[in-house]
Interface confidence: low
Amino acid sequence: EEELQVIQPEKSVSVAAGDSATLNCTVSSLIPVGPIQWFRGAGPGRELIYNLKEGHFPRVTPVSDPTKRNNMDFSIRISNITPADAGTYYCVKFRKGSPDVELKSGAGTELSVRAKPSAPVVSGPAVRATAEHTVSFTCESHGFSPRDITLKWFKNGNELSDVQTNVDPAGKSVSYSIRSTARVVLTRRDVHSQVICEVAHVTLQGDPLRGTANLSEAIRVPPFLEVTQQSMRADNQVNVTCQVTKFYPQRLQLTWLENGNVSRTEMASALPENKDGTYNWTSWLLVNVSAHRDDVKLTCQVEHDGQPAVNKSFSVKVSAHPKEQGSNTAAENTGTNERNIY
């Protein structure tokens, strides 16, 4: 009597995640009577995948009708393949019994799964930084297989080199993750800049996935302050201007102080954007010199994006010549400055 053969013709099968995998198996004889079962892995820890005799297996269907007369084809189709399905599958013939007795196993078919990486997610620093500082951006993508993958960073189209990339796990796995960190030196012109993380993988057919982050979320451009006095008017009123320029983000509060006392507080809103993405703002304060007996110290105080306040001060000298015209002079561009106006 010829020995029963269990034939698995393919040594390996490669399938894209989401597709169906067909695992072929035929037997050479209907004798002895008994069921076929499919397992993933070998030995005592093997996992039952399908039992043509009985059971509930939602994603597995037989290719041929197992009740068909003279059926010797016990191939199965596994639907909606995921990386977790990778492994070696064995078609095993059992002899009918109580319980069934394992008779013969096929040589096994290795199922490998090609899984696309998830869309790269780029995250930037938790707090903003100013120009000349280095900030780190992180890019993550998960769930891909096989392990080979390429990740590149770009800033405004130019590839970045200060990059550290890791693919995990290091050993064999059903799927992998990649994490990469890029260090970027900020400049004042980076409000409109963008970093791109580009991931290339065999499953993407040459069309890489991209994740982006705007440097506008990471940068703070502190303002320049310039305080100038416009000409004194005939009614003894001095018009003092505080120009706040080239700042980002827009979140800014300006306070005028007269002799240390708050005169007016304003919040920047709906400002027009400069070409480089920064903002400018001008505030005016009208001071009635004749209402003061002593010198008037005017301070323009700016709080930008929650940072410590920056001050610019002017001293308006109340003298015997209050109507003398002042010049359009600006305070020096330092943190706190005073200028006497006669």
Epitope: V33, K53, R59, K96
Partner: antibody, heavy 115, light 111 residues
């Protein structure tokens, strides 16, 4: 492919009764046989499935009240100690549910339990 | 244990109309799709209509359709015919192999 029940009759309470499902056109090594009953004026009620080899299972309410066995072409359902509540038409059907649904069904056999 | 709640208990429809019966499982059925629909007429055995929630059984007219997943399932008869007068049962399967439970049934009366 067909299944047919037999063995239904009038029995007194406590008298064991065996119903037989005879199959043709398919092999009992490939499919389980499920038993369903319908009491007069009531809905369908799943009893259990007699599978291949020693694989036999019953709904929780039916455990201890029924047993199952099979040969190459027949499946038996034994009502171990019938009560009047077991009066019903008993159906057998090929299949064990899910992707092996109950199909085809036999015409049914009537069991009456009365003293 | 799984409980299958079927609504309505009875529904009347005119020839050519549409009938819908719903089945709600007390927990997700096995594989989210272990749900079959059966047609039962007096004096006859039940007949399989739909299995795996939405797969039409061989020889069943396409006016019957099934939908749903998890715990909510629907059988729809579009273009009802007089021959469709029957009681319709859902059968849900739980994670345990013996946990197969019929709904209470929906009687369809065709006017």
């Amino acid at each position: 492919r067909s299944v047919e029940e037999s063995g239904g009759r009038l029995v007194t309470p406590g008298t064991p009764l065996t119903l037989t499902c005879t199959v043709s056109g398919f092999s009992l090594s490939s499919h389980g046989i499920s038993w369903v009953r319908q009491a007069p004026g009531k809905g369908l009620e799943y009893i259990g499935t007699i599978g291949t080899g020693v694989i036999t299972y019953f709904a929780s309410w039916a455990k201890g009240r029924f047993t199952g066995s099979k040969t190459s072409t027949t499946v038996d359902l034994k009502i171990t100690s019938p009560t009047t509540e077991d009066t019903a038409t008993y159906f057998c059907a090929r299949g064990s549910a899910w992707n092996d649904p109950f199909d085809p069904w036999g015409p049914g056999t009537l069991v009456t339990v009365s003293s | 244990a799984l409980v299958m709640t079927q609504t309505p208990a009875s529904v009347s429809a005119a020839v050519g109309g549409t009938v819908t019966t719903k089945c709600q499982a007390s927990q997700s059925v096995y594989g989210n799709n272990d749900l079959a629909w059966y047609q039962h007429k007096p004096g006859q055995p039940p007949k399989l209509l739909i299995y795996l929630a939405s797969t039409l059984a061989t020889g069943v007219p396409s006016r019957f359709s099934g939908s749903g997943s998890g715990t909510q399932f629907t059988l729809t008869i579009t273009g009802v015919q007089s021959d469709d007068a029957a009681t319709y049962y859902c059968l849900g399967g739980g994670d345990d192999e013996a946990d197969n439970v019929f709904g209470g049934g929906t009687e369809v009366v065709v006017k």
